[in-house]
């Protein structure tokens, strides 16, 4: 299904405009900001979501780097250029002709330059580390139960194949979710780990992108898991190219 047929909405993306103008009068939804038709049976790409979000650019993400090759999204929100499939174009430029190269999750991976800057390929982010801190609880969560609950969540809510959740680490109150997805592993139809991480990040911030679904209500054996802060680290298949240490 491409969209909810009865009331013509997009379950997986509230930042859309939907109308029954698809083939055979089927419901079709287009992303705000770009007008690109989206598949409402799966997650919308982060590029299209950021483009739609630019009407209200708030809560820019700041990420912490775990090692010298990890990227920090300290440029905040920008209005991205997306390709016809909704992926980030390798080169992004702003209105003042300042350009830079990005990875598959849209994070800058080179120094800024001018219009002559070349970005030969879109470099894939193949490893994402989601670092969470949960609010104090009476005791620590059972590690196995917590691990299973988070794996279930990524399968059920974000439709991320279980093979892409590499590990769940827990040292109270810190939880780390490792997502890994090489170019060779990602089959047609597979949700991208970058998109799953972005949806999860918005969910834990109380800014769910889903239409008509309740907000994220994480529970481990009935005990609420409330996230205090989220940091996301991105690692690319090819290390970033900066002229000096940032």
């Amino acid at each position: 299904h491409t969209a909810a047929q009865d009331n013509c909405t997009c379950p997986t993306n509230k930042m859309t405009v939907c109308s029954p103008d698809g083939p055979g009068g089927r419901c079709q939804c287009r992303a705000l900001g770009s007008g690109v038709a989206v598949d409402c049976s799966t997650l919308t790409s982060e590029c299209l979501l950021l483009k739609a979000r630019m009407s209200a650019p708030k809560n820019a993400r700041t990420l912490v780097r775990p090692n010298e090759h990890a990227l920090v999204d300290n440029d905040g929100l920008y209005d991205p250029d997306c390709d016809p499939e909704g992926r980030f174009k390798a080169r992004q430029c702003n209105q003042t002709s300042v350009c830079w190269c990005v990875n598959s999750v849209g994070v800058r991976r080179t120094d800024k330059g001018d219009l002559s800057l070349r970005c030969d390929e879109l470099v894939r982010t193949h490893h994402i580390l989601i670092d969470l801190r949960h609010r104090p609880t009476a005791g620590a969560f059972n590690h196995s139960d917590l691990d299973a609950e988070l794996r279930r969540l990524f399968r059920e809510r974000y439709r991320l194949h279980p093979k892409f959740v590499a590990a769940v680490h827990y040292e109270q109150p810190t939880i780390q979710i490792e997502l890994r997805q090489n170019t060779s592993q990602k089959a047609a139809g597979d949700v991208d780990i970058g998109d799953a991480a972005y949806y999860f990040e918005r969910d834990v911030k109380g800014e769910s992108l889903f239409q008509g679904r309740g907000g994220l209500d994480l529970r481990v054996r009935g005990e609420p898991l409330q996230v205090e802060r989220t940091l996301i680290y991105y690692l690319d298949e090819i290390p970033p190219k900066f002229s000096m240490k940032r």
């Epitope: 609950e149 794996r151 439709r159 194949h161 529970r219």
Partner: antibody, heavy 117, light 106 residues
Amino acid sequence: QVQLQQSGPELVKPGASVKMSCKASGFTFTDYVIGWVKQRTGQGLEWIGEIYLGSGTIYYTEKFKGKATLTADTSSNTAYMQLSSLTSEDSAVYFCARGSIFPFDYWGQGTTLTVSS
Amino acid sequence: QIVLTQSPAIMSASPGEKVTMTCSASSSVSYMYWYQQKPGSSPRLLIYDTSTLASGVPVRFSGSGSGTSYSLTISRMEAEDAATYYCQQWSSYPYTFGGGTKLEIK
């Protein structure tokens, strides 16, 4: 094609334990999840728990904690469920089923367990 | 845990007749899954994500609903559709099934 081949019927005495198997073929074993479901004669389906084959992560329903033990041998592409301290209430057909981005997309043919003295 | 209640428990239909069965959840779920089970066989995934037909399922089957109320419809009953149908959720642990609707042919 995807197949889940379960072990044959078991007749065991009360108080004993039993270990049944679910051999997978036609897919990359460690990429998936194997869930287990109980069905008593003429009754509905009851979920027991699941094991993430790549990480070994296991979740049991409260009712089956201490009753069921889920394991897997990745070298033989086989998942196992052991049931302990058996009573007549454990007599049932037990199914294994593969999980992916769906809870259960392919099912085994079931293993019939009879607990009787 | 989320309790799923199916109704009716047993029903019968003539060939060509439209059949509708329902599944009510004790709290809201994101999607519903439906399985068909024939005597002596294992369950078979019929419908996923509330309304999407699994591979090989005839188009006479359809699913709909949201929140706490879901339904499975067979537009024209056929003899091979005689089976027990189960709804199932996995919006939260533990996964739960409905008690089943047994569909018989008249």
